[in-house]
């Protein structure tokens, strides 16, 4: 929930707003509820329908660390376990992803650049 200060002169100094909940499906027009003391407000809001691009895919996974490099294939792998799926998304419970192994120098550079992305 996000908190928001309101300009002086209004009765409430700090409104707490809940998430925008679409009225249908996963995107489009919806409502956001706000509270301030005993007061409540309901305002129109919109969740963009390209939310997949903006907020991640239909299926979110929690990944293990990358495994060791497989010399025969030149790749390393890691497994992901389903963390959350959009209600109607038919997601695999576990997935396995691979990527090419890189030399130590490249790995170090990549690790610095891509920190927190793996």
């Amino acid at each position: 929930k996000k908190k928001e200060k309101v300009k002086k002169g209004s009765e409430c100094s700090e409104w707490t707003w809940g998430p925008c909940t679409p009225s249908s499906k996963d995107c489009g027009m919806g409502f956001r509820e706000g509270t301030c003391g005993a007061q409540t407000q309901r305002v129109h809001c919109k969740v963009p329908c390209n939310w997949k691009k903006e907020f991640g895919a239909d299926c979110k996974y929690k990944f293990e660390s990358w495994g060791a490099c497989d010399g025969s294939t030149g790749t390393k792998a890691r497994q992901g376990t389903l963390k959350k799926a959009r209600y109607n998304a038919q997601c695999q419970e576990t997935i396995r992803v691979t990527k090419p192994c890189t030399s130590k120098t490249k790995s170090k550079t990549k690790a610095k650049k891509g920190k927190g992305k793996d």
């Epitope: 998430p19 499906k25 376990t81 389903l82 959350k84 799926a85 209600y87 109607n88 997601c91 419970e93």
Partner: antibody
Framework: QVQLQQPGAELVRPGHSVKLSCKAS????????MNWVRQRPGQGLEWIGM????????ILNQKFKDKATLTVDISSNTAYMQLSSPTSEDSAVYFC??????????WGQGTTLTVSS | DIVLTQSPATLSVTPGDSVNLSCRAS??????LHWYQQKSHESPRLLIK???QSISGIPSRFSGSGSGTDFNLSVNSVETEDFGMYFC?????????FGAGTKLELK
Amino acid sequence: QVQLQQPGAELVRPGHSVKLSCKASGQSFSSYWMNWVRQRPGQGLEWIGMIHPSDSETILNQKFKDKATLTVDISSNTAYMQLSSPTSEDSAVYFCSSWSAKRGDFWGQGTTLTVSS
Amino acid sequence: DIVLTQSPATLSVTPGDSVNLSCRASESISNNLHWYQQKSHESPRLLIKYASQSISGIPSRFSGSGSGTDFNLSVNSVETEDFGMYFCQQSNSWPLTFGAGTKLELK
């Protein structure tokens, strides 16, 4: 496979809030949407709302927005639904069900809530 | 809210008969329609998801069809254990809604 355990019955006085539980065992509890459904005696099924244990995202049927509060406790693999200011109209069987679009769903046996003084 | 209308309200059949249950949505819901069976004093049991997808452990005599606003559940050669209530449910938009049900009873 997910098993959902719900108390068979709960008795509550009118106006006294009650918290119904739904304990999951088996496969990962935190990956799937947990739905709550009401069935009044001799009636059909009514969706109350759902919560995702991974981040507590909640979608509530507006009809129940002043009645039901959904929460989860990941440490005990338990989902809860609190009903505020219950009246005799809230006497019903309350089901929880864990939903996956991929594999389908699993239902608890339901809790029969009786609101009576 | 999306309204689901089920028909008929009651269906009286003899074991061995084949039957069709109908569910009509008040607006298009794509294929986001699921069928449940419920016997007295039991939890609902999912029979078909997403209009036509079968569920592990459900007998093959149950099948679903339809898209948009009109959906059907077919039971090929009804068995005595099939008697009970049948509900359709949509997951296309919030709130999720159920039909009022069709009662499948012994003639």
